[in-house]
Interface confidence: low
């Protein structure tokens, strides 16, 4: 499909020429950040960003590639090295710990320096560090976690816990010589490392003792509270908090956002992590736009301003199970929430940051036509004879032969939101990609986002836009905090 | 490995806050740009660049990605989208119609507007759109074209020439009828549609006459002259200037370029694409480094400024054969240019800018332990209970099935420079990758490449940065070639 | 699994012949390459062709057979080696063979050959 | 390409060993597509070794091989009287018109 009007050169000429006024007009601001968010797109590597957004614009009728993803409108972008200090590639707990706290980790740990050790509880003390969600609360912000995944999963736990095993969501999971040894389980951190304001995502099982049943499943055990401590520690973080509020379900989260009792808000709408959004019950779970929203209204009424994590965090399990229909929705939705977040923030006092904590082996090939689905097949066939779609894994558990050959593929199979596309290696999950990363900046200090940075490098322009720790004396006019 | 040394957070924290401060000083240059660098990196998407990165670090007895390439100094970074006007995964025609003319064209045509249909002569005519290359010229410039390809191929190509075939290096790639039409062979469009000062790359075979013995490999027919119009276009093209010389080796370029009697510098190393660097015979051929410092030491004789191309051609080649090491370490070279080119030029007056034309459906995954090799296995072992490498493709010619099974690999399987990585599905050649790729750039005007752009912004970023046509009334100071 | 070549004979020179390559317990359609070698008495072995089966057409030749010897797959379980032109030169002891890859290029076939067929006498005599 | 081999014949004894090399005049795809098969008269031709050094199932550990790109090694330790035989070597190129065999080598046991 060629379009018309791009068959003429002045088509791209006054384009590129519009995008240059643009460029030209660009004027870095020398004023702090009052309020910082990073949108955090688990596992969104540049290959996932791109299928995003032909997919968003295909959605819309277009063409798809020359449409943009709300994070493409940032003005700023740089590129992050994700490795963790152990590994080329890295896991969610170790980059978490970069782009959070500004120091990397090994894999598998959180809120914890590389003098930590995977799984060795007795190298936890005197190894924490401390996230730049922590140091503004310590300043007086409001401060915020919303995810698509366990409010106690390995991302967001980087804001506020410290952990050498990111699998140990509840006091069950931690081996019972480590619990002797003081080490403690992220729920726990979760309601007692930092008073944070708004938690909305999943993860209710890992709060509430074994045997209580789930709200939403109630016959179903697994589904229900796994702690062996007996304790309830939404009942415990209620009552630090004379506004607290716990919800969990879309009408209630909508109805505490809107009220302006509710001082504190924490919302869990799944005992695990939440659904996908394709298959999201809509009456139910709310969206990760509205859980977006919803954290905005609460934490904006802070005059000294907030930081806010939101987390597209199934986009990484999507890819995980080679399923890109369930990534690239993923991701779009993600994007839908930073867009709506930019339409309730200005950019003269917000620093909005995107970006993913490591890449997936996925990737987009095959010189398919313009306008053809992300989802399709590519023009031709293999040198098997057969069928390949333009969407492939390096490794993972779409790996598949049939009678010793690799499988044919129709366009009605792989446009299945079920269908596995295949890869190289056969793997129970398919794994995180090494690549460096995207990051796209803007409000106040977005132009310090340049070039090649280490991951880290996150978690310090968004402690120095704001003058947080170690920033304090950052020079910057207004001086964040002074509008109280 | 874990370096003792980034167990301390001082370590991340120190690192950071040094890179804020260098983010911090970052002046946007008001002035103009004398001179204009592209570095051109063939299928180099960012798994590419990380993997290349690892290895030039690991070849300098480092870990790896704690490491920076030359492109990784570049301060400012963009993303460019870099589908065709038909394609949503673009061929090296169409993009360089993009980055060298600003203009988007179709799958496999070059210097065209997307009304010019592929392999279709009669649409070529009204449809030619004039590269940055070509304006520099007009200004004054002296310009020029240095590859590890044949000079001929798509990416050069762009810079001079207008065609809906690529393939049509020499007339004996020119069906009949296109001939009659009027349609010329890229090699002629070479030396007569503009003055080209420097041409170093391969590509001999499509100047001579059928016949012509080539003068490295006299004894292999296959290698000699193509041409059926019995012209010689070296001799033509020497014709044309007074101080024109033709160099075929390494020795008689070095003395070429140290000559101050030669204007004008004609190099053609190999009958086809240049020898891949592992493979290079250093007696007979230059690097791509050593041409590009030749190319920069005649063009920067000229008061007014240079345009000057430069592309590692191969990286391109060795992914399309899913042999990651003959990418890397073509990659490697390519930034061993990048670092020479600097070194020899100054970004007071250069502006230089680095990037891709496409990706590749290559990847790097499997969570390899921090200082291992790039081309090692993955820890553990995949479903099938055999070794996989932590590179993969999608889709390529490394396919295979072994008694109906994928093949077991071994370190020092993998680690040779022939082995051929695994693919999903089997293709004779491994295809291009349609995410965005990164723009790298420093100097004059550098800070006007931002965000997410379309592939043709880079060259509206050239011309205005330069005052080329059409920003002639660029406004920047001092204006372009008033040095002289 | 087993392979056996029949269609063997004493021609004449510049007599043609067909020789048939016949699998048992597996089919073509397994994706293997099917390859046709010849071995001269008292002499070496020689690779002449191969085939991709499940019908795909892909063959590949030894520069000295291309033109002279055609490879073809006539059923799942039968390939077929056509030779025409004999000589004296092609008086040889022909075996087909099943490469160890389902999938390979062709080009390294002579070097995974796993299952081969007793051979079949080939005699060119006036 | 063109394969040499160790002139024939080449004598070993019973429980020792023997080497027989294999030189390619080129390298071989991927450094070590490189096959050893053993012929028996009036019997095909039997794959050992593939890929310069792994072992087709059913053949004795005694058979091992080994090298990279242009030389190439089959060794035979414990040598069997039933290990009397023609070894070829057979190499897999990038270009298949270079696909070939070497000229044998006849290996009598004492």
């Known amino acids: 499909i060629i379009p018309v009007e791009e068959e003429n050169p002045d088509f791209w000429n006054r384009q590129a020429a519009e995008a240059l006024g643009a460029a030209k007009k660009l004027q870095p601001a020398q004023t702090a950040a009052k309020n910082l968010i990073i949108f955090l797109g688990d596992g969104m590597g540049v290959s996932t960003v791109t299928a995003a957004r032909i997919l968003k614009g295909q959605k819309k009728d277009k063409l798809g590639p020359e449409t943009f993803l709300a994070m493409d409108r940032f003005p700023y972008v740089a590129l992050s090295k994700t490795y963790s200090v152990d590994k080329h590639v890295p896991d969610s707990g170790a980059t978490a710990t970069a782009y959070l706290c500004g120091v990397k980790g090994n894999f598998q740990t959180i809120g914890l320096s590389a003098a930590a050790r995977f799984n060795q509880c007795n190298t936890t003390r005197g190894n924490e560090v401390i996230s730049v969600m922590n140091r503004a609360k310590k300043a007086g912000k409001s401060v915020g976690v919303v995810t698509t995944t366990r409010v106690q999963h390995a991302s967001p736990a980087g804001a506020y816990a410290h952990t050498v095993n990111r699998n140990w969501y509840s006091d069950a999971d931690v081996p019972a010589s480590a619990r002797q040894e003081g080490c403690q389980d992220i729920a726990t951190q979760l309601i007692s490392n930092m008073d944070i304001d708004v938690i909305l995502g999943g993860g209710r099982k890992y709060m509430f003792p074994m045997g209580t049943p789930d709200p939403e499943y109630p016959d179903d055990y697994s589904q229900g509270g796994t702690r062996l401590d007996g304790k309830n520690l939404v009942q415990e973080w209620l009552a630090k908090h004379q506004g607290a509020r716990y919800v969990w379900n879309r009408t209630e989260l909508l109805q505490a956002s809107l009220d302006p009792s509710v001082t504190h808000l924490m919302g869990l709408f799944e005992p695990g992590d939440m659904k996908y959004e394709i298959h999201r019950d809509s009456t139910l779970d709310p969206s990760l736009m509205e859980m977006t929203e919803a954290a905005l209204l609460l934490l904006s009424r802070n005059p000294r301003g907030f930081f806010l994590f939101v987390e597209g965090g199934r986009i990484d399990h999507g890819h995980h199970e080679s399923r890109a229909y369930r990534a690239l929705t993923e991701t779009i939705m993600f994007d839908d929430a930073i867009e709506r977040a930019g339409q309730l923030t200005s950019e003269e006092d917000t620093l909005s940051l995107v970006t993913a904590d490591h890449s997936h082996v996925f990737s987009f090939g095959g010189y398919p036509l313009r306008g053809s689905s992300i989802f399709g097949l590519a023009p031709g066939k293999a040198r098997d004879r057969k069928a390949y779609t333009v969407l492939l894994y390096g490794n993972g558990p779409g790996y598949v032969l049939k009678d010793g050959a690799r499988p044919d593929v129709t366009e009605s199979e792989s446009g299945s939101p079920e269908y596995r596309q295949q890869s190289a290696v056969p793997l129970d999950g398919e794994t995180h990609a090494g690549e460096d990363v995207a990051v796209f900046a803007r409000g106040p200090q977005a132009h310090l986002v340049h070039g090649v940075q280490e991951q880290t490098f996150i978690a310090h322009v968004m402690a120095f836009a704001a003058c947080l720790e170690p920033y304090t004396a950052c020079d910057l006019a207004p001086r964040a905090g002074t509008t109280d | 490995i874990i370096p003792v040394e980034e167990e301390n957070p001082d370590f991340w924290n120190r690192q950071a806050a040094e890179a804020l401060g260098a983010a911090k000083k970052l002046q946007p240059a008001q002035t103009a740009a004398k001179n204009l660098i592209i570095f051109l990196g063939d299928g180099m998407g960012v798994s590419t660049v990380t993997a290349a990165r690892i290895l030039k670090g690991q070849k300098k007895d480092k870990l790896g990605p704690e490491t920076f390439l030359a492109m990784d100094r570049f301060p400012y970074v963009a993303l460019s989208k870099t589908y065709s006007v038909d394609k949503h995964v673009p061929d090296s025609g169409a993009t360089a119609t993009a980055y060298l003319c600003g203009v988007k064209g179709n799958f496999q045509t070059i210097g065209l507007s997307a009304a010019a249909r592929f392999n279709q002569c009669n649409t070529t005519r009204g449809n030619e759109v004039i590269s940055v290359m070509n304006r520099a010229k007009k200004a004054g410039k002296s310009v020029g074209v240095v590859t590890t390809t044949r000079v001929q191929h798509a990416s050069p190509a762009g810079a001079y020439a207008h065609t809906v075939n690529r393939n049509w290096y020499s007339d004996a790639d020119v069906p009949a009828s296109a001939r009659q039409e009027g349609c010329q062979d890229i090699a002629t469009q070479l030396i007569s549609n503009m003055d080209i000062d420097v041409i170093l790359g391969g590509g001999r075979k499509y100047m001579f006459p059928m016949g012509t013995p080539d003068p490295e490999y006299p004894d292999d027919y296959s290698q000699g002259g193509t041409r059926l119009d019995g012209k010689n276009l070296v001799q033509e093209w020497l014709a044309k200037h007074q101080g024109a010389r033709y160099v075929w080796n390494r020795t008689e370029l070095l003395q070429a370029s140290l000559d101050p009697s030669v204007t004008h510098l004609m190099g053609l190393f190999e009958p086809g694409d240049m020898k891949y660097e592992i493979h290079r015979d250093s007696t007979l051929d230059p690097s791509l480094m050593e041409m590009t410092e030749a190319a920069l030491l005649l063009l920067s004789r000229n008061p007014r400024g240079f345009f000057l191309f430069v592309e590692g051609g191969r990286i391109d080649h060795g992914h399309h054969e899913s042999r990651a090491y003959r990418a890397l370490t073509e990659t490697i070279m390519f930034d061993d240019a990048i670092e020479r080119a600097g070194q020899l030029t100054s970004e007071e007056d250069t502006l230089s800018l680095v990037t891709a034309d496409h990706s590749h459906v290559f990847s790097f995954g499997g969570y390899p332990l921090r200082g291992s090799s790039i081309f090692g296995l993955a820890p553990g072992k995949a479903r099938d209970r055999k070794a996989y490498t932590v590179l993969l493709y999608g889709n390529g010619p490394g396919y295979v099935l072994k008694d109906g099974a994928r093949p077991d690999v071994t370190e020092s399987e993998s680690g040779s420079p022939e082995y051929r990585q695994q693919s999903a599905v089997p293709l004779d050649g491994e295809t291009h990758a349609g995410e965005d790729v990164a723009v790298f750039a420093r100097g004059p005007q550098a800070h006007l490449v931002h965000g997410v752009q379309e592939q043709t912004f880079i060259a509206h970023v050239m011309a205005f940065a330069a005052c080329l046509e059409p920003y002639t009334a660029c406004d920047l100071a001092p204006r372009a070639g008033t040095t002289d | 699994q087993s392979l056996e070549e029949s269609g063997g004979d004493l021609v004449k020179p510049g007599a043609s012949l067909t020789l048939t390559c016949t699998a048992s317990g597996f089919d073509f359609s397994s994706y293997y390459w099917i390859c046709w070698v010849r071995q001269a008495p008292g002499k070496g072995l020689e690779w002449i062709a191969c085939?991709?089966?499940?019908?795909?057409?892909?063959t590949y030749y030894a520069t000295w057979a291309k033109g002279r010897f055609t490879i073809s797959e006539t059923s799942s379980t039968t390939v077929t080696l056509q030779m025409t032109s004999l000589t004296a030169a092609d008086m040889a002891t022909y075996f087909c063979a099943r490469s160890l890859y389902t999938w390979r290029y062709a080009d390294y076939a002579a070097s995974t050959l796993n299952l081969w067929g007793p051979g079949t006498l080939v005699t060119v005599s006036s | 390409a063109v394969l040499t081999q160790t002139p024939s014949p080449v004598s070993a004894a019973v429980g020792g060993t023997v080497s027989i090399s294999c030189q390619s005049s080129q390298s071989v795809y991927n450094v070590n597509l490189l096959a050893w098969y053993q012929q028996k008269p009036g019997q095909p031709p039997k794959l050992l070794i593939y890929?310069?050094?792994k072992l087709e199932s059913g053949v004795p550990s005694r058979f091992s091989g080994s090298g990279s790109g242009t030389q190439f090694t089959l060794t035979i330790s414990d040598v069997q009287c039933d290990d009397a035989a023609t070894y070829y070597c057979a190499g897999g190129y990038s270009s298949s018109k270079d696909n070939s065999f070497g000229g044998g080598t006849e290996v009598v046991v004492k």
């Open positions: 890929e310069t050094s």
């Open positions: 085939i991709y089966g499940g019908s795909s057409g892909s």
